[in-house]
Interface confidence: medium
Amino acid sequence: ARNGDHCPLGPGRCCRLHTVRASLEDLGWADWVLSPREVQVTMCIGACPSQFRAANMHAQIKTSLHRLKPDTVPAPCCVPASYNPMVLIQKTDTGVSLQTYDDLLAKDCHCI
Amino acid sequence: ARNGDHCPLGPGRCCRLHTVRASLEDLGWADWVLSPREVQVTMCIGACPSQFRAANMHAQIKTSLHRLKPDTVPAPCCVPASYNPMVLIQKTDTGVSLQTYDDLLAKDCHCI
């Protein structure tokens, strides 16, 4: 049976969750967000070799066609499978507001 | 206002739906699928430049961090936003069966 967890490119090179620290300035948010001053942005990074963490049938097809036609069909891509919510304290005309964003931080990853 | 659909790389180069013809042999399905003999596989192909078809906040963040740290953070990727169902006639021990797959053909695309 296929081990969908084994990365044939070597440890750590395949699709998985990573965290990148970013300031409000890095994100271009300094003019509308008050807090947090720094965000631990979780995102999906890494290669998607054959059948590694394939999200669905479409990903499996993409892998097959990429093997046949690499110049035409790209390999599957490492993207979020789900997200964690994050609360931002935003500047408003009247003061501040708390806003929850459901699609900001990746929670886990797959290849599609 | 930003036109999230305008491709700065030139017409046709950015993330969009494409169709790739594939035989059952191409897909590795010849041993379990009877029909169709050929599939018009719709898939998402193309570049995701700054804010083009950004799926959500996460995609916008990814664009910002890719600009800052291109060696660490990849650009957003062109993936299906939704799917069209497809019916396959499959071989079974006793004959054939019709099976609908909901995650096989891309319907439209975005960058994430």
Epitope: D5, H6, P11, G12, R13, R16, H18, T19, V20 | T72
Partner: antibody, heavy 117, light 107 residues
Framework: QVQLQESGPGLVKPSETLSLTCTVS?????????WIWIRQPPGKGLEYIGY???????YYNPSLASRTTISRDTSKNQFSLKLSSVTAADTAVYYC??????????WGQGTLVTVSS | DIQMTQSPSSLSASVGDRVTITCRAS??????LNWYQQKPGKAVKLLIH???TLHSGVPSRFSGSGSGTDYTLTISSLQPEDFATYFC?????????FGQGTKLEIK
């Protein structure tokens, strides 16, 4: 043979910063693996603190992220943990480990850190 | 975070016995389940990764199975050196989380 060894003070005062180092032998920390800190409070389960990766990426458990810094010194083949503003709840055995494919295949023996005045 | 519920918390058995330890995740973890052995004063050892793959050097009496949310570690014939604490860990979603452990004692 890959070996990991934790070192650092066994006693830290409340509100101070806990600092630990993990020395790795038999394998370069500059390779494509994740270098991890885990802790186990007395009589409790294991808690994942976070990792450092060769490209400079780090991950911190959200429950500890505001107080955690994990860094590396490739010249010494070491990686370190700093946990600020400690309380008695941070008393635990702290382990370093290597994760090369979604599993921790080598661990240090662990070092007990007590937070007390 | 994904919660990992391990059972039993302790277990008494004899040399030669077949022993089973179970681990249940609060959501599907797609077979990203690892098992470890812990002995006092020793480094933790990885036994099994990705549900059923034996880590190098681990005796074949250890085996793992499961899918979805439910996973099992089996020791087919207990040896004296197997008396230890065993714990599971999910590697599907960060932060990785662990079961509370099963202490395997001599009867």
């Amino acid at each position: 043979q890959v070996q990991l060894q934790e070192s650092g003070p066994g006693l830290v005062k409340p509100s101070e910063t806990l600092s630990l180092t993990c020395t790795v032998s038999g394998f370069s920390i500059n390779s494509d693996c994740y270098w991890i800190w885990i802790r186990q409070p007395p009589g409790k389960g294991l808690e994942y603190i976070g990792y450092t990766f060769y490209s400079g990426i780090t991950y911190y458990n959200p429950s500890l992220a505001s107080r955690t810094t994990i860094s590396r010194d490739t010249s010494k083949n070491q990686f370190s943990l700093k946990l600020s503003s400690v309380t008695a709840a941070d008393t635990a055995v702290y382990y370093c480990a290597r994760d090369c494919d979604y599993a921790m295949d080598y661990w240090g023996q662990g070092t007990l850190v007590t937070v007390s005045s | 975070d994904i919660q990992m519920t391990q059972s039993p918390s302790s277990l008494s058995a004899s040399v030669g016995d077949r022993v089973t330890i179970t681990c249940r995740a609060s959501q599907k973890i797609s077979n990203y389940l690892n098992w470890y052995q812990q002995k006092p004063g020793k480094a933790v050892k990885l036994l099994i990764h990705y549900t059923s793959t034996l880590h190098s050097g681990v005796p074949s009496r250890f085996s793992g199975s499961g899918s979805g949310t439910d996973y099992t570690l089996t020791i087919s014939s207990l040896q004296p050196e197997d008396f230890a604490t065993y714990f599971c860990q999910q590697g599907n979603t960060l932060p990785w989380t662990f079961g509370q452990g099963t202490k395997l004692e001599i009867k």
